[in-house]
Amino acid sequence: AWELTILHTNDVHSRLEQTSEDSSKCVNASRCMGGVARLFTKVQQIRRAEPNVLLLDAGDQYQGTIWFTVYKGAEVAHFMNALRYDAMALGNHEFDNGVEGLIEPLLKEAKFPILSANIKAKGPLASQISGLYLPYKVLPVGDEVVGIVGYTSKETPFLSNPGTNLVFEDEITALQPEVDKLKTLNVNKIIALGHSGFEMDKLIAQKVRGVDVVVGGHSNTFLYTGNPPSKEVPAGKYPFIVTSDDGRKVPVVQAYAFGKYLGYLKIEFDERGNVISSHGNPILLNSSIPEDPSIKADINKWRIKLDNYSTQELGKTIVYLDGSSQSCRFRECNMGNLICDAMINNNLRHTDEMFWNHVSMCILNGGGIRSPIDERNNGTITWENLAAVLPFGGTFDLVQLKGSTLKKAFEHSVHRYGQSTGEFLQVGGIHVVYDLSRKPGDRVVKLDVLCTKCRVPSYDPLKMDEVYKVILPNFLANGGDGFQMIKDELLRHDSGDQDINVVSTYISKMKVIYPAVEGRIKFSTGSH
């Protein structure tokens, strides 16, 4: 028998520095977690102790903090090289700055193979990107070789900016021939490493003949065997065992997100490459693990540029940006409109001639808007200003919801109106009218939504049975502020870009902004 240790990360999302327990900015260092310096300590400890070790990343290193905003992926290549990753799969967020924003900072600089079998380049891009990412890689480990096949969510064109010269194929269809090639090369230990979410990971384990292990990402799935060490609730045991269609037991793993855990899986193979046993658990990277001093010093060196960036002007406002709780928790506020407009603008994807865009709606809990921005400071808006408005380090995500769920959400928005509670929704691409004289749960009297399958966007009444795409904060997608109906009834959820980054990019693009209060949210006569 031959034993392999797979160390894995996924959805690190720019958390190069240690973070608080909830993966936001580290405040009390003695209770902080993760970060590349701490990760390196643990990886090196395992490499020294065990003979056959692979360090793999399942995508979405890009996007999530000011590190990515400033360094645009150069930080990912630099620190992943320093940690000596063995391979990485492309995630959807790796395309957030377009193909060039992937090629130059990461693909050309990474000293490890970057993989995806279901992304096919065409046109002029094909020769430019040739060899910079691969469908699979055979890695030598000890006296054996291990095949790694990559995959990426086929939804990427709707979630990011891969352009028109990359085709995202069905994962299973694309993976099978690559696995077959590996078998033809007499490679009999094969890991599928990719970024399509836990449900697809399980399908790959079930359907792709020859895959021995699946290491996934995208859904931020936390798996654990035994008592979990922090706040995350396990979605299943680690590893999660799937019985393949040809009767094999295939371990599937993921390691939550944000570099909080290091996935640790030990696999035993027989001489024919069959998995005999698999066991392990994610390792919580808490403060009991010291940060590696040399990596930490490097982090501190790179940090300097971030501090300078946060005070630079992004753009100007010529109006007061009202982000006060007195406004945003009670009525339409122009800060809410600005943020929602930025959220929609960040998700413009012309992927189908029938649709002007794939999504037109935004909802945003008023309680998530934490500060106004005064225009009387020469109109200057900085990252620092935006960090005061959006201090939680969240993301603006894409969900699919039925009209009926949206209706419930808007009822919840005003179910206890008047108490300055955070669930009052700011909107974009939606016209809502409330009648507060009616009883809670029956206060939405009009709900019109902007069409997407149209050449001239207009507002149509919400249809209860129709499925709509909506951009919203991850906080709401996870049921925050009492929006349990969104969490329970959402049909799809893809995590998006860092909230501040979305707004800062929009302001930089617009240069001068002047959001108005324009009647997106109304109260029917006599009730307000």
Partner: antibody, heavy 118, light 107 residues
């Protein structure tokens, strides 16, 4: 473009050692295997072994174990092969080559002629 | 070790002819066969891998085929620049092994 530049010809005495270099450019050195191949005058090709610079893994053809030692220097993107206890049987042209994605030899150095003679 | 046998040390052909060079593996190597061309004083040059996948820049007159353990490189219309030494290689398992070579010459 991908290039592998080998060191010049060597004339060495029996029993001595020789170190051949293979300097690469035009690609990320750590991401591809470097293979070494022997070709005796008027004869076929023999695979000596590989080094994978990414993790410095080395695999030898059993026939060349003890004869060749493969190393790599990531900082200069250069692979090396040392041949020891040389005999006339080791007189040959030695090639370094790079894979496309494992196991076939897509790009070759120009070859280094080693002549073992007293 | 897998032995790759190229039974023809020399093959004579004329410009414009179709010619096939064969190579027999001592055991099943599936489609994991590559072909190389070597001219005097030069390094070998990869033509084909995976039995029939042409390497970048290789003219489409070069094709490969497999039938059981018999592997074939075919040149559909021989050009003057094709006169060279051809090696097969199995990339199925280590140690990777080559055939002894077939020299293509003018009749």
């Amino acid at each position: 473009q991908v290039q592998l530049q080998q060191s010049g010809p060597e004339l060495v005495k029996p029993g001595a050692s020789v170190r051949i270099s293979c300097k690469t450019s035009g690609y990320t050195f750590t991401n591809y295997y470097i293979y070494w191949v022997k070709q005796r005058p008027g004869q076929g090709l023999e695979w000596i072994g590989w080094i994978y610079p990414g993790n410095l893994n080395i695999k030898y053809n059993e026939k060349f174990k003890g004869k060749s030692t493969l190393t790599a220097d990531k900082s200069s993107s250069t692979a090396f092969m040392q041949l020891s206890s040389l005999t006339s049987e080791d007189s040959a042209v030695y090639f370094c080559a790079r894979d496309d994605n494992y196991a076939w030899f897509a790009y070759w150095g120009q070859g280094t002629l080693v002549t073992v003679s007293s | 070790d897998i032995v790759m046998t190229q039974s023809h040390k020399f093959m004579s052909t004329s410009i414009g002819d179709r010619v096939s060079i064969t190579c027999k593996a001592s055991q099943d190597v599936s489609t994991a066969v590559a072909w190389y061309q070597q001219k005097p004083g030069q390094s070998p040059k990869l033509l084909i891998y995976w039995t029939n996948t042409r390497h970048t820049g290789v003219p489409d007159r070069f094709t490969g085929n497999t039938s059981g353990t018999e592997h074939t490189l075919t040149i559909s219309s021989v050009q003057a620049e094709d006169l060279a030494l051809y090696y097969c290689q199995q990339h199925y398992s280590t140690p990777f092994t080559f055939g002894s070579g077939t020299t293509l010459e003018i009749k």
